[in-house]
């Protein structure tokens, strides 16, 4: 299953399959997730080691048993790949690292006014993988405001150095935020020239294209079909690049197919997995296991659940079957692709779905009246769980926020439905940033069921929580995916990085905002909060957040929206925007429903019809 816990001061011994430099453990974990054989990783921050060569070292590891011995190493961080973790799988990495220079091939230098502008330039340059920016206070005046666009053979820095007044980060192309746009066309009987960066075997051009999209240096590809004249080159997928970023030439060639990486597509990238099953095809590779199962779909599920399995073949040969079950061959290879593809066999083959974003779990969890005042504009995909709850009577308007917690579930505040309990009048918009982008053609979700907490009473602050079941499940994308829920009764975690988001008023007597706003707000203890609200009872099922001096808060229109906190690189839904005295007033923190206290209720209500809780446990 999915394991998200990080082990501090621990290093996995042995099992190395690759190593690289990464700026933090989260980026190292992402590289492990996308590496075909990596199950575990260990990361050495700069503070953890004196050896300059090993600083920022990210070590990717495999293990036949799925685990390795941990040795104590001060400062080291270790963890698991996020394969099998559904919507948490993403190649998108937005963080900017201060005081760090990520080295690589510098191919473009320009003057820009901010690190955000530098990141945008990298994202809009086809060859840029990461960048470094020298700030206004950099020690050498001639380098100040320099934005260096970079690439490397592996897509990660060739070295990382601690350097004052330098900020570094990665391209946001994997976040589907590139302005370049992409070529969706696939060209028959055409071979591209230029430099081959990798060679893999694939059953069709679509798989070849997806592999190209997620390969750090692939810009375009040529695929040799299974009827290509040279037998040894059949089903070969050549991943390619060029200095210019486009093919310098193409040659008409029977039975070849060429196309482009889709990494520069805006707003939508293909999933990093291949779900199609290929009948009459055998995939060869290293044998991991052989099991008898009923049907090719069960074989694929078995492969997906066995984390080291990369692809499979389900044999229908009479000698491989007994009763209704046949042999399911679970296989793997060094590069994650079959080592041999044979056609016209009595088998059906396909790939593990361990890297699919979607998963089929409806709620993500972990084991172990109000709007934003003093906030700033959010950017695309920054808060992909945020939804807008709108009411359509004669006109249509935004009333509340909400959080997507599963394919078919939204968590919000019960008071949003005060006087409006009819599900037909509500429209739920997900995957949006600007309310002005909503037109009559914008898709929205309708409500199948509103589940208000049984102890909630109108105009009381207690149990201000409600679940919405959507009529149809939503697909997950970079812009629309769920937030994980905290552990039941989560009291031990100290959250220091918490944010509130919404489209609500920007001042007490204001109006709904167009662009989704965000504000970083510290949590306040319940004792402190109770002192500020002596006329109200602040219960242990509430959580408060705010600055003593005020100025930043949620406000009208933010109700029901998320209070999220980042811990160990993972966002969790800590609170639901509920109430407060005015907005952003001095010594009047915002009050939020404490989600951890309602985990039993949430899980009970989101149980599937067969009585099994459809939830994801990453830890």
């Amino acid at each position: 299953g999915c394991l998200t816990q990080l082990y501090e001061n621990a290093f996995f011994r042995g099992g190395d399959v690759a190593s690289m430099y990464t700026p933090n453990a989260q980026y190292c974990q992402m590289r492990c997730t996308f590496h075909p054989r990596c199950l575990l990783f260990s990361f050495l921050p700069a503070s953890s080691i004196n050896d300059m060569e090993k600083r920022f070292g990210c070590f990717l590891k495999d293990s036949v048993t799925g685990t390795l011995p941990k040795v104590h190493r001060t400062g080291a961080v270790s963890g698991h790949s996020l394969k099998q973790c559904g919507h948490q799988i993403s190649a998108c990495h937005r963080d900017i690292y201060k005081g760090v220079d990520m080295r690589g091939v510098n191919f473009n230098v320009s003057k820009v006014s901010s690190v955000e502008e530098c990141q945008k330039r990298c994202t809009s340059n086809i060859r840029c993988q990461f960048f470094s920016y020298a700030t206004q206070t950099f020690h050498k005046a001639e380098y100040r405001n320099n934005c260096l666009l970079k690439y490397s053979p592996g897509g990660t820095p060739t070295a990382i150095k601690v350097l004052s007044n330098v900020e570094s980060g990665f391209s946001l192309k994997p976040c589907a935020l590139s302005e370049i746009g992409c070529h969706m066309n696939i060209f028959q009987h055409l071979a591209f020239s230029d430099v081959d960066v990798a060679r893999v075997l694939t059953p069709d051009a679509f798989v070849c294209r997806t592999i190209c999209t997620y390969h750090p240096n692939c810009l375009f590809f040529t695929f040799y079909t299974n009827v290509w004249k040279i037998e040894s080159q059949r089903n070969v997928c050549l991943l390619k690049t060029s200095e210019s970023g486009t093919p310098s030439s193409s040659t008409p060639q029977e039975n070849t197919i060429s196309g482009y990486s889709l990494l520069t597509c805006k707003r939508t990238l293909p999933e990093p997995c291949h779900s199609k099953i290929y009948p009459g095809v055998d995939f060869g590779g290293e044998e991991l296991n052989v099991t008898f199962v009923k049907g090719v779909n069960v074989c694929q599920e078995t492969c997906t659940k066995m984390i080291r399995c990369q692809f499979f073949t389900y044999s229908l040969l009479p000698e491989d079957c007994k009763e209704e079950k046949c042999k399911c061959f679970l296989r793997l290879s060094m590069d994650g692709s079959p080592t041999r593809i044979a056609y016209g066999t009595q088998g059906s083959s396909g790939y593990s779905l361990r890297l699919c974003n979607t998963g089929d779990n409806s709620v993500c969890t972990t084991k172990t009246s109000t709007r934003i005042v003093g906030g700033t504009n959010s950017s695309w995909g920054e808060w992909p769980w945020q939804v807008s709850l709108q009411v359509k009577l004669t006109a249509q308007r935004h009333l509340c926020g909400g959080s997507l917690i599963g394919h078919q579930w939204v968590l919000t505040a019960a008071h949003c439905f005060d006087g409006l309990p009819l599900q037909d009048v509500w429209r739920i918009y997900s995957g949006i940033l600007n309310l002005s982008d909503i037109t009559k053609d914008t898709p929205f979700s309708q409500i199948k069921e509103i589940i208000i907490h049984q102890n909630y009473k109108v105009s009381e602050g207690n149990h201000d929580i409600a679940l919405i079941k959507l009529q149809a499940p939503l697909n997950y994308t970079e812009f629309q995916k769920p937030i994980c829920l905290p552990s039941k009764g989560d009291t031990s975690t100290i959250y220091t990085n918490c944010w509130v988001t919404g489209w609500g008023f920007s001042k007490e007597k204001g109006e709904i905002q167009n662009i989704l706003q965000k504000v970083n707000i510290p949590l306040v203890t319940n004792e402190e909060c109770q002192k500020r609200y002596q006329d109200y009872k602040i219960t242990q099922r509430m959580v408060c957040a705010g600055y003593k001096e005020g100025g930043k808060d949620a406000c009208k229109g933010d109700s029901g929206g998320p209070l999220v906190c980042k811990h160990n690189g993972m966002w969790r839904l800590v609170g639901i925007t509920s109430w407060g005295e005015g907005c952003a007033r001095r010594e009047q923190p915002g009050v939020y429903t404490k989600v951890a206290e309602y985990m039993d209720w949430i899980l009970e209500k989101t149980q599937s019809s067969d009585g099994k809780a459809q939830m994801q446990s990453p830890a």
């Epitope: 969706m184 028959q188 009827v227 197919i257 779900s275 199609k276 009459g280």
Partner: antibody, heavy 119, light 107 residues
Amino acid sequence: EVQLLESGGGLVQPGGSLRLSCAASGFTFSSYMMHWVRQAPGKGLEWVSGIYPSGGWTDYADSVKGRFTISRDNSKNTLYLQMNSLRAEDTATYYCARLVAGLDAFDIWGQGTMVTVSS
Amino acid sequence: DIQMTQSPSSLSASVGDRVTITCRASQSISSYLNWYQQKPGKAPKLLIYAASSLQSGVPSRFSGSGSGTDFTLTISSLQPEDFATYYCQQSYSTPRTFGQGTKVEIK
């Protein structure tokens, strides 16, 4: 010129049999996966059956499974569809089609042959 | 089996009009989607493969888009020879299934 030419259609009684042929020319027939697709009068297209180049793997729509058999003779560049236990609902124009390798689209179609099942 | 639903089932348009036909799959089919044109008494003809790629010899006024479950065929400026029935077809899984067709008629 790449071409597919069907033959063998006609009028047959319910329960009867018929064998359709599809002669290919202008391309290396033995390299391509071939399929049969049918269209009932005034209706849409329905995939019927497919066969790999070597003939080692065949596939059928549920509606014809156990009654129809697809086969090929690569030495004669010909595709066949043996239809047994014919029913009135099998009445249709039958097209043979070539599948583009690596893309899974029917790029070349024959002109079709009409099969009428009626008493 | 994957169901393919086309809309509208028929439409009337004039020469020069922009025409859009949609096709929805009952489950995600990635980009494994093809479009065909069929004229009365003739065999179907491949127009678009892989959701958006134009088959050789097909005029550039035809274009396709979409991925996952929702797909669109667009004719930017309808010509007299474009009056026909259009079918979408998924090749993601067997049985390969077609939409019920959209008949484009002269207004």
